[in-house]
């Protein structure tokens, strides 16, 4: 299913009816939905653990900011926001004996930095995107995807891993963020909320969308994920927001119709190959980009995030199927599987289009023009 293109002057347009309007006043976040910048208590004092593969002796990734003085060393990212009613409770949690620091869950113990020290890094994901503050970067060209239209055979593995539903992708799906920035797709997974509660990871001006798709890619400069982890640009994720629309999305239905088969945590099924690009917005030219991290442990940094301006429409029934079918460990529903937004700590989000030019009511506020760092610099 191909989606209508959004208006040129409407960052992240597309309401529940699939129209071209930007987010209206009724979409403004409630207070508890706002990005949280405060530090969680006690996380500064967490014991360290062995570094993750590929992160040894690496210099700190430089933020995309002209003024490094704007970074405060005392700032730590918000790893958990248990007080946020939107945050999941008791999900993806394993009751296992023994000292197991590698289990993790959303919205509770153990604190993620104890699971992986990288989760306390300064340049974490997801983040709140403020189009008005994004730096327009003409060097950001349309994304190039090759080989994403898969034949029905061989079939692909669809798995409920306890904290998401994940589709493993075969070799041959190539993606370029620009000249010399080539990647191959590894897997895709989704993040969602619960009935009446949105569950995207990234937010836009504090607005959380119903769900979000992530397509994870490995740089062709690396043979393996563990070699690329923590290396700047080693991994790249394409992210798109999922919204409610009037019609069933036939591409997503190929996956959603199989979720009942993998309702149980740890279960998997085989699904026919499909057009992976049909799961993404049709406009590959308008997007936001920044350097962040994996949004789940090990939270490795150096990940290039590309968040589409255009959204993808699913029917209300499809969004309900996504959020109400799967189970995590311990007889808990797999819902609200998103991480709280993390502070930018001086990072500048770049836009491939002039996102600050906005006809919405919010355009009245002064626009801060951030400068663009040419891609690859």
């Amino acid at each position: 299913q191909r989606l209508p293109r959004m208006q040129e002057d409407s960052p992240l347009g597309g309401g529940s009816s699939g129209e071209d309007d930007p987010l209206g006043e009724e979409d403004l976040p409630s207070e508890e939905d706002s990005p949280r910048e405060e530090d969680p208590p006690g996380e500064e004092d967490l014991p360290g653990e062995e570094d993750l593969p590929g992160e040894e002796d690496l210099p700190e990734v430089k933020p995309k900011s002209e003024e490094e003085g704007s970074l405060k060393l005392e700032d730590l990212p918000t790893v958990e926001a248990p007080g946020d009613p939107q945050e999941p409770q008791n999900n993806a949690h394993r009751d296992k004996e023994g000292d197991d620091q590698s289990h993790w869950r959303y919205g509770g113990d153990p604190p993620w930095p104890r699971v992986s020290p990288a989760c306390a890094g300064r340049f974490q994901s997801p983040v709140d995107i403020r189009p008005q503050l994004a730096a327009f970067c003409p060097a950001l060209r349309p994304l190039e995807l090759l080989g994403f239209q898969l034949p029905p055979l061989p079939e692909l593995r669809l798995r409920n891993n306890g904290h998401s539903v994940q589709l493993t992708l075969p070799p041959g799906l190539e993606m370029a963020l620009g000249p010399g920035r080539e990647y191959r797709a590894l897997q895709l997974h989704l993040h969602w909320g619960a009935a009446g509660r949105p569950g995207s990871e990234h937010t836009v001006e504090g607005h959380r969308f119903p769900a979000e798709i992530h397509v994870v890619h490995l740089s062709t400069a690396f043979a393996r994920v563990d070699e690329a982890l923590g290396r700047p640009g080693g991994l790249a994720v394409l992210a798109a927001f999922l919204e409610e629309g009037p019609e069933e999305n036939s591409a997503y239905e190929q996956l959603l119709s199989r979720l009942e088969e993998i309702a149980e945590e740890g279960s998997e099924t085989q699904v026919p190959g499909l057009d992976i690009s049909a799961l993404l917005p049709s406009d590959f030219s308008r997007y936001f980009q920044y350097e962040g991290s994996l949004t789940t442990p090990p939270c490795a940094q150096g990940v290039i995030w590309t968040v589409f301006n255009q959204t993808v429409m699913l029917s209300a029934k499809q969004l309900h199927t996504l959020s109400d079918t799967l189970w995590g460990p311990g007889d808990s529903r797999l819902q609200l599987n998103f991480r709280a937004t993390q502070p930018l700590n001086g990072r500048v989000i770049e836009a491939s289009f002039p996102a600050g030019v906005d006809s919405s009511p919010r355009a009245a506020e002064p626009v801060q023009l951030n400068s663009c760092l040419a891609a690859g610099d």
């Epitope: 653990e49 296992k96 590698s102 992986s116 079939e155 593995r157 891993n161 306890g162 393996r224 090990p298």
Partner: antibody, heavy 122, light 107 residues
């Protein structure tokens, strides 16, 4: 360089429980799958099972009722217990590192221990 | 459970010759989850190929893997003395299985 070392008793009596531990050195145990494989003398390789560092497990269906695996990330170790052993469980037992992250992306078992011989006999 | 059948059971060749080893699966296997190992007497197996065709770190380019679906092949373009060993294919899914092995011996 990651290295694996199996340890445990070399002799186990029939009907008892075989217990082995694999110690990971030179790298972190976290976020990998860890496998046990066995090989009877002069025969082929048989996969016993795997554990992810979250505690998630998959076992060989033919051994599932007798196998338990656990992981202790604080000690960089994972363990195998095989109950109600018989002479047919006599083999060299290997531990090996498998895929990274719960991403279902597979790179093969790229690091192996040297193996430990377990004999089941009274 | 996916059964992997390797053939031939034994391959008798001379150094410098080309070795072609076959692995057939009882049902379709994603290329992402097909690996090949080499094992010499008294040693642990060594990963040669993963993802059906990707060479593991440090593996010479005379080793190559190919195939998809149910038929996979390991090719050693020019046998060196140290290549005489037993070779196993392996599939990795929710359960893992190994083939029975092919012994490559000196003719």
């Amino acid at each position: 360089q990651v290295q694996l070392q199996e340890s445990g008793p070399g002799l186990v009596k029939p009907s008892e429980t075989l217990s082995l531990t694999c110690t990971v050195s030179g790298g972190s145990i976290s976020f990998y799958y860890w496998n046990w494989i066995r090989q009877p003398a002069g025969k082929g390789l048989e996969w016993v099972g795997r554990i992810y560092t979250s505690g998630s497990t998959n076992y060989n269906p033919s051994l599932k009722s007798r196998v338990t695996m656990s992981v202790d990330t604080s000690k960089n170790q994972f363990s195998l217990k095989l109950s109600s052993v018989t002479a047919a469980d006599t083999a060299v037992y290997y531990c090996a590192r498998g895929g990274f992250l719960e991403w279902d992306y597979y790179y093969g078992m790229d690091v192996w221990g040297q193996g430990t011989t377990v004999t089941v006999s009274s | 459970e996916i059964v992997l059948t390797q053939s031939p059971g034994t391959l008798s060749l001379s150094p410098g010759e080309r070795a072609t080893l076959s692995c057939r699966a009882s049902q379709s296997v994603s290329v992402t989850y097909l690996a090949w190992y080499q094992q010499k007497p008294g040693q642990a197996p060594r990963l040669l190929i993963y993802g059906a065709s990707s060479r593991a770190t440090g593996i010479p380019d005379r080793f190559s893997g190919s195939g998809s679906g149910t038929d996979f092949t390991l090719t050693i373009s020019r046998l060196e003395p140290e290549d005489f060993a037993v070779y196993y294919c392996q599939q990795y899914g929710s359960s893992v299985t190994f083939g029975g092995g092919t012994k490559v011996e000196i003719k």
